[in-house]
């Protein structure tokens, strides 16, 4: 229904908490390079305006939109030019036209330092003295690194921060208490931003349509008792949430999907028999416990896919009368049945079933044409399933740090013109679905891997839109979402790449290296493996082995040494004329 | 084209029963939810009842509960709705739906009238 003041009804919805957390982090997904205390002038500043409105939806500007009124807001402040340089020209636009520019200089890869956690004490400390504040700069450091991050489940992850930190603030050893639970809240939230942004991808590059058919198969796995017009209805308010979302109406957004849990909740009886431990739940725990929520047990006396979808006499009047619906049918019907398959390979074969029906409906004897259909998805079914075994027996051999350099050196050989950082990036996080997804039950694997993949992968291509350097990868990135990851998969080594010349200062390291973290260490060291890559792209398994294994012992050596900065100096020369003779 | 026929309607004193039915073509029945819905003299619509296709699940308003009965025959195509123990209040126009979406309906029959008085 209509409402006079949008951001009344939003504010009166949401709760001021809420509310005031979902515009700072609108504020900080559009203006990324502005500090904290700027962000929370202006969060204040809005907060104050829509409790006016609250009081009274006829006072002035009340009934301007929260784009307008948002936009409004940034376009004031000082010296944005400066700062933000083109983004500034949004400003000169009108609404819609402004909101779009904004979206569009959104930076995925904004020039920011890692998110670096302050030490136990200081951490509680600064949370105990303003919970509110910590909590909001927390909000804004994510956002702002993670433009397109859900903003609803930004809002959980706060939450979740802030029970972590009530509970081992009080602890004796905060750090012991504080870092493996920080840890996992960072993890999961690390993969929900990847998750986020590759639904986002999908709603820009391929419109609802798309995105609605990932959500039916979806929806479809974990609901296998609902009816197709049920799992119509939640893929239908689910693609409406994150096209919100994705488009910056982060308030609307974020009450559509309390409206949507509130619905849920009271429709278990036609969704699902495992939702009510989720519907007991506070409003933001709720939501994310049913987006989280285990799978339904399939229905024992489904008939075969085949009567309805093959062996029907009529499917080509079907298909005819309503192609997407007919279309949507087959896929739920599927989906609904294979839990054990990867939302990805599920759409590969509703577009391989498609694509027959096309044909066949159009030849003088359909029946004929599409009677094999079923048996012609196996090659699709078998192509993922053995990219996991494969894969999972390799990090079982490697262990995930090893498994990570394996992919780095596969990777940097396919696309050796992607910069090394990228590289690094995408190799550690595509080496994380071994320990992420292996250690699964054998049909949970599946759907883990693949859909991981596709999320991290798309994360490359986002990255690479922005400096295109390969066309490999461009290529890859181009086609279908679904089709990406056994792209990637397929692509062998770049024949066209002259490799890089090799530069002595590349792999020159001094006694700094010593005392970074671990996780630092290995990125300096998988650094130099992307730079061997690229410097001997057709370098055997066991020249590189020979090299990193050198170079391990080498910083090893040197870390230990009485004379750090000398056992550098001097065994560093050494260590850079035995790689390049080895790799010769 | 789709095409919802529905039948059964008449007059019926209080108490009486009735069996309204509708008879669809133009879309593959078996694959849709299917409902009745009712509109009174000067009154809004009202959902009466609404049945899964496989007719595993079935919804029913309050003030129809334990006195109406929908079921469906999908060899048939076929919808039906057993009105015993009627009353005044269940006097309107029972138009036969068929929905695309759990909560939406996007087509209607012409309705059939049923008229309870004594």
């Known amino acids: 229904e209509a409402h006079k003041s949008e951001i009344a009804h939003r504010f009166k919805d949401l709760g001021e908490q809420h509310f005031k957390g979902l515009v700072l982090i609108a504020f900080s997904q559009y203006l990324q390079k502005c500090p904290y205390e700027e962000h929370i002038k202006l969060v204040q500043e809005v907060t104050d305006f829509a409790k006016t409105c609250v009081a009274d939806e006829n006072a002035e500007n009340c009934d301007k939109s929260i784009h307008t009124l948002f936009g409004d807001k940034l376009c004031a402040i000082p010296k944005l030019r400066d700062n933000y340089g083109e983004l500034a020209d949004c400003c000169a636009k009108q609404e819609p036209e402004r909101n779009e520019c904004f979206l569009q200089h959104k930076d995925d890869n904004p020039n920011l330092p890692p998110f670096q956690r302050p030490e136990a004490e200081a951490m509680c400390t600064s949370f105990q003295e303003n919970p509110t504040s910590f909590l909001g700069h927390y909000l804004h450091e994510v956002a702002r690194r993670h433009p397109y991050f859900y903003a609803p489940e930004l809002l959980y992850y706060a939450e979740k921060y802030n029970e972590v930190l009530t509970q081992c603030c009080t602890e004796s050893d905060k750090a012991a208490c504080l870092t493996p639970k920080l840890d996992a809240v960072k993890e999961k939230a690390l993969v929900a931003a990847v998750r986020q942004r590759m639904k986002c991808s999908s709603m820009q590059r391929f419109g609802e349509r798309a995105f609605k058919a990932w959500a039916v198969a979806r929806m479809s796995q974990r609901f296998p008792n609902a009816e197709f017009a049920e799992i119509t209805k939640l893929a239908t308010d689910v693609t409406k949430i994150n096209k919100e979302c994705c488009h910056g109406d982060l308030l609307e957004c974020a009450d559509d999907r309390a409206e949507l849990a509130k619905y849920m909740c009271e429709n278990q009886a036609t969704i699902s028999s495992k939702l009510q431990a989720c519907c007991d739940k506070p409003v933001l725990q709720k939501s994310q416990c049913l987006a989280e929520i285990e799978h339904d047990n399939i229905p024992a006396d489904l008939p075969s896919i085949a009567a309805d979808f093959v062996e029907d006499k009529e499917v080509c009047k079907n298909y005819a009368e309503a192609k997407d619906v007919f279309l949507g049918t087959f896929l739920y019907e599927y989906s609904r049945r294979h839990p054990d398959y990867s939302v990805s390979l599920l759409l590969r074969l509703a577009k391989k079933y498609e694509a027959t029906l096309e044909k066949c409906c159009a030849e003088g004897d359909p029946p004929a044409c599409y009677g094999t259909v079923l048996a012609e998805f196996q090659p699709l079914v078998e192509e993922p399933k053995n990219l996991v075994k494969t894969n999972c027996e390799l990090y079982e051999k490697l262990g995930e740090y090893g498994f990570q350099n394996a992919v780095l050196v596969r990777y940097t050989q396919k696309a050796p013109q992607v910069s090394t950082p990228t590289l690094v990036e995408a190799a550690r996080n595509l080496g994380r679905v071994g320990t992420k997804c292996c250690t699964l039950p054998e049909a949970q694997r599946l759907p883990c891997v693949e859909d991981y993949l596709s999320a991290i992968l798309n994360r490359l291509c986002v990255l690479h839109e922005k400096t295109p350097v390969s066309e490999k990868v461009t290529k890859c990135c181009s086609g279908s979402l679904v089709e990406r990851r056994p792209c990637f998969s397929a692509l062998t080594v770049d024949e066209t790449y002259v490799p890089k010349e090799f530069k002595a200062e590349t792999f020159t390291f001094h006694s700094d290296i010593c005392t970074l973290p671990d996780k630092e260490k290995q990125i300096k060291k998988q650094t130099a493996l992307a730079e061997l890559v690229k410097h001997k792209p057709k370098a055997t398994e066991d020249q590189l082995k020979t090299v990193m294994g050198d170079f391990a012992q080498f910083v090893d050596k040197c870390c230990k040494a009485a004379d750090k900065d000398n056992c550098f100096a001097t065994e560093g020369p050494n260590l850079v004329a035995r790689s390049k003779e080895a790799l010769a | 084209e789709v095409q919802l026929l529905e039948s059964g309607g008449g007059l019926v004193q209080p108490g009486g029963s009735l069996r309204l039915s509708c008879t669809a073509s133009g879309f593959t029945f078996r694959h849709y939810r299917m409902g009745w819905v009712r509109q009174a003299p000067g009154k809004g619509l009202e959902w009466v009842s609404w049945i899964r296709p496989d007719g595993t699940f079935t919804y029913y308003a309050d003030s129809v509960k334990g006195r109406f009965t929908i079921s469906r025959d999908n060899s048939k195509n076929t919808l039906y709705l057993q009105m015993n123990s009627l009353r005044a209040e269940d006097t309107a126009v029972y138009y036969c739906?068929?929905?695309?979406?759990?909560?939406?309906?996007?087509?209607w029959g012409q309705g059939t009238l049923v008229t309870v008085s004594s």
């Open positions: 739906a068929k929905s695309y979406m759990a909560d939406r309906f996007d087509y």
